[in-house]
């Protein structure tokens, strides 16, 4: 299916005469009849096998024909056909004079014919127009023509039907030759098959739309390459769908039998050691002082009379404790205590008897401490130095070495770096932990505001009307050099228009 299109461009009949040579009155009101038919070596009258079309009156005598495809499709003229284009044709174009308004063949006198042209040849389907001009003794006709396929028809003969679609039956557009061109993400003869997510497992995965990867029963994951264990599986995995391969410590068909009760349930109490002894069975080895299947019962450790030398036993949460009689000490009161006769005091400490000689006390000299004066006093242990000062032991005393900026016995005083007014030109001083900082007034910079910097008074563009601005470095002010026609400190007033003051 296609359309033969004929575009009439210009008709010349300068003398305004009919084919018979008789002039038209008042002029030749010209319309055209077109006949399209199969190829004939010699074009002869007969049926217009491919179609006919007539125009209204297009002009008088000589005229150019407007392209009127938008206004009703009269030019180019359309000769549709619904068969395979054969590639050859015959074309007859007749120009007629219309004395009245009735253009029907039977309403016209036979001598109303102005001119008749007949051509034949081969014509391929395509978008390009073929331009032609036919001249007779008295007339000239310029025109162009082409054959194009109807919507949804393609190929050299407009015989290939292709209608683009994007639905369940296909996802494609049509190429110029009528072949299907699949939309992105679709494949197959009719572009009905989605292209799944790249890497989607060929057997285990499928898709219903492009870039998707849906898994067949028993498979999971982004690419459907990992299996799903059996529905009843409890502590297992799989290498193929619905398997149940037990994790370590589990057994049974569905991996629900506990072979490692110790790890999974920690049944033994009070620090006992657990040993697996079969499915869901275990043995607890208790720590001293505990008994029971799970070592949950505490033995009274005083039952074995562990305290010696008359010591009394007291049960405690984590064992027992011996209260020793005077003169004995140790876990089980197994050691007898020292007396001053044993010279127990070190570093010149003096011994004093207590409780009728049952025990003693040491009086320690300075710099020593402990029940036997065995420890040297470290006066720095209490960290007495503030603000990061370093503590130094100096014989019987101590001293603090302070960080810069601090003073005092314990470095507790902050030395003010601002006390000596270090900031020049009226700069404001700020004490910091590690020194000081100066905030400089306008026109000065540097760590101590010692550098003079000029203020660019022109930076704010204070001058109007394209005046030139100059900075007075001595006073840090600006001067405006006014262009002709302007006055004022900022060149803001036009000459001849004095400022209007409100009084």
């Amino acid at each position: 299916s296609g359309v033969f299109q004929l575009q009439l461009q210009e008709f010349i009949n300068e003398r305004g005469v009919l084919a018979s040579g008789r002039p038209c009155e008042p002029g030749c009101r010209t319309f055209f009849r077109v006949c399209l038919k199969h190829f004939q070596a010699v074009v002869s009258p007969g049926p217009c096998t491919f179609g006919t079309v007539s125009t209204p009156v297009l002009g008088t005598n000589s005229f150019a024909v407007r392209d009127d495809s938008s206004g009703g499709g009269r030019n180019p003229l359309q000769l549709p056909f619904n068969f395979t284009w054969p590639g050859t044709f015959s074309l007859i174009i007749e120009a007629w004079h219309a004395p009245g308004d009735d253009l029907r063949p039977e309403a016209l006198p036979p001598d109303a014919l102005i001119s008749k042209i007949a051509i034949q040849g081969s014509l391929a389907v395509g978008q390009n127009w073929l331009l032609d001009e036919q001249t007779s003794t008295l007339t000239r006709l310029r025109y162009s023509y082409r054959v194009i396929c109807s919507d949804n028809y393609y190929g050299d003969n407009c015989s290939r039907l292709c209608k683009k679609r994007n639905d369940h039956f296909g996802h494609y557009v049509c190429q110029p030759d009528g072949n299907l061109s699949c939309l992105p993400g679709w494949t197959g003869e009719y572009c009905q098959q989605p292209i799944c997510l790249s890497g989607c497992h060929e057997q285990n995965g499928y898709c219903s739309k492009p870039a998707e990867c849906l898994c067949r029963p028993g498979w999971q994951g982004r690419l459907c390459n990992e299996c799903i264990p059996h529905n009843g599986c409890r502590h297992g995995t799989c290498s193929t769908p619905w398997q149940c391969t037990c994790d370590e410590g589990w057994g049974g068909l569905f991996c629900d039998q506990d072979l490692n009760y110790c790890t999974h349930h920690s049944p033994c109490k009070n620090g006992a050691t657990c040993s697996n002894s079969g499915q869901r069975s275990y043995t607890c080895t208790c720590r001293p002082g505990y008994t029971g299947v799970d070592c949950e019962l505490e033995l009274s450790e005083c039952d074995s009379n562990p305290c010696r030398n008359g010591g009394s036993c007291k049960d405690q949460e984590d064992g027992y404790h011996c209260l020793c009689p005077p003169g004995y000490y140790g876990l089980h009161c197994e050691h007898s205590t020292l007396s001053c006769a044993d010279s127990p005091c070190f570093n010149g400490g003096s011994c004093r008897e207590r409780n009728q000689g049952a025990n003693y006390a040491c009086e320690c000299p300075p710099n020593f401490t402990g029940s036997n004066c065995e420890k040297k006093v470290d006066r720095c242990t209490s960290n007495p130095c503030a603000n990061g000062g370093q503590c130094l032991n100096r014989g019987p005393s101590r001293m603090c070495r302070c960080r810069p900026g601090f003073t005092g016995t314990y470095c507790e005083l902050h030395v003010s770096d601002c006390a000596r007014n270090p900031c020049a030109h009226g700069g404001t001083c700020h004490d910091l932990e590690n020194g000081l900082m100066c905030t400089c007034p306008a026109g000065f910079s540097g760590r101590r505001c010692e550098v003079r910097t000029s203020i660019d008074a022109c930076a704010s563009s204070p001058c109007f009307n394209r005046a030139t601005c100059y900075t007075d470095l001595s006073t840090d002010t600006f001067v405006c050099n006014c262009p002709y026609g302007f006055v004022g400190s900022r060149c803001e007033f036009p000459v001849g228009l004095p400022p209007s003051f409100p009084w």
Epitope: S208, C215, P217, G218, Q220, G221, I228
Partner: antibody, heavy 118, light 107 residues
Framework: EVQLVESGGGLVQPGGSLRLSCAAS????????MAWVRQAPGKGLEWVAT????????YYRDSVKGRFTISRDNAKNSLYLQMNSLRAEDTAVYYC???????????WGQGTLVTVSS | DIQMTQSPSSLSASVGDRVTITCRAS??????LAWYQQKPGKAPKLLIY???NLADGVPSRFSGSGSGTDFTLTISSLQPEDFATYYC?????????FGQGTKLEIK
């Protein structure tokens, strides 16, 4: 014994958010895909979302896509459903279930009620 | 999406009766069908998977059959604890879909 216990349901206004949790025990949680299935009052069952055990791939029913997010924390044996932009039609009992979209739902929690109403 | 249609939507029966519930899929789902039992206020419970496999701990009076698009759940001799709502579910195609349910009541 396999146990799935949901929590986090409640009354929320349309457009609001809610986060459901599901605590799993009695099986090796990290080995199994999990899902959320809901049941509107007096209605049938409706699959909502699924997450794989292997790589955390997620799937959602069309009506919740872009609003709900399923996630899991294998270290905590927990499954979650973050629900945003809630609508009245999301009102349902939400069940945590063990299974994928292409396998039966072998074990179910007791459910948690989500009511979306102004 | 595949539509699952259960029939009947409700039925009354007596203890000891043989009961059959059917489930029809809108397209072929092979044998990828499960049946669930749900009692009021409780969670569903898996009864049968892969059309005819009994889930762990489910009594043998429950059985399943069918393939393709037509499936059946049969309870050979009703017990008092069997009165509940039964759902079928297909897991052959994404997304998974359930039937609307069949309520089994005491006559």
């Amino acid at each position: 014994e396999v146990q799935l216990v949901e929590s986090g349901g409640g009354l929320v206004q349309p457009g609001g958010s809610l986060r459901l949790s599901c605590a799993a025990s009695g099986f090796t949680f990290s080995n199994f895909p999990m899902a959320w299935v809901r049941q509107a009052p007096g209605k049938g069952l409706e699959w909502v979302a699924t997450i794989s055990s292997s790589d955390g791939t997620t799937y959602y029913r069309d009506s919740v896509k872009g609003r709900f997010t399923i996630s899991r924390d294998n270290a905590k044996n927990s499954l979650y459903l973050q629900m945003n932009s809630l609508r009245a039609e999301d009102t349902a009992v939400y069940y945590c279930a063990r299974g994928y979209y292409n396998s039966p739902f072998a074990y179910w929690g007791q459910g948690t009620l989500v009511t979306v109403s102004s | 999406d595949i539509q699952m249609t259960q029939s009947p939507s409700s039925l009354s029966a007596s203890v000891g009766d043989r009961v059959t519930i059917t489930c029809r899929a809108s397209e072929d789902i092979y044998s990828n069908l499960a049946w669930y039992q749900q009692k009021p206020g409780k969670a569903p419970k898996l009864l049968i998977y892969d059309t005819n496999n009994l889930a762990d701990g489910v009594p043998s009076r429950f059985s399943g059959s069918g393939s393709g698009t037509d499936f059946t759940l049969t309870i050979s001799s009703l017990q008092p604890e069997d009165f509940a709502t039964y759902y079928c579910q297909q897991y052959n195609n994404y997304p998974p879909t359930f039937g609307q349910g069949t309520k089994l009541e005491i006559k």
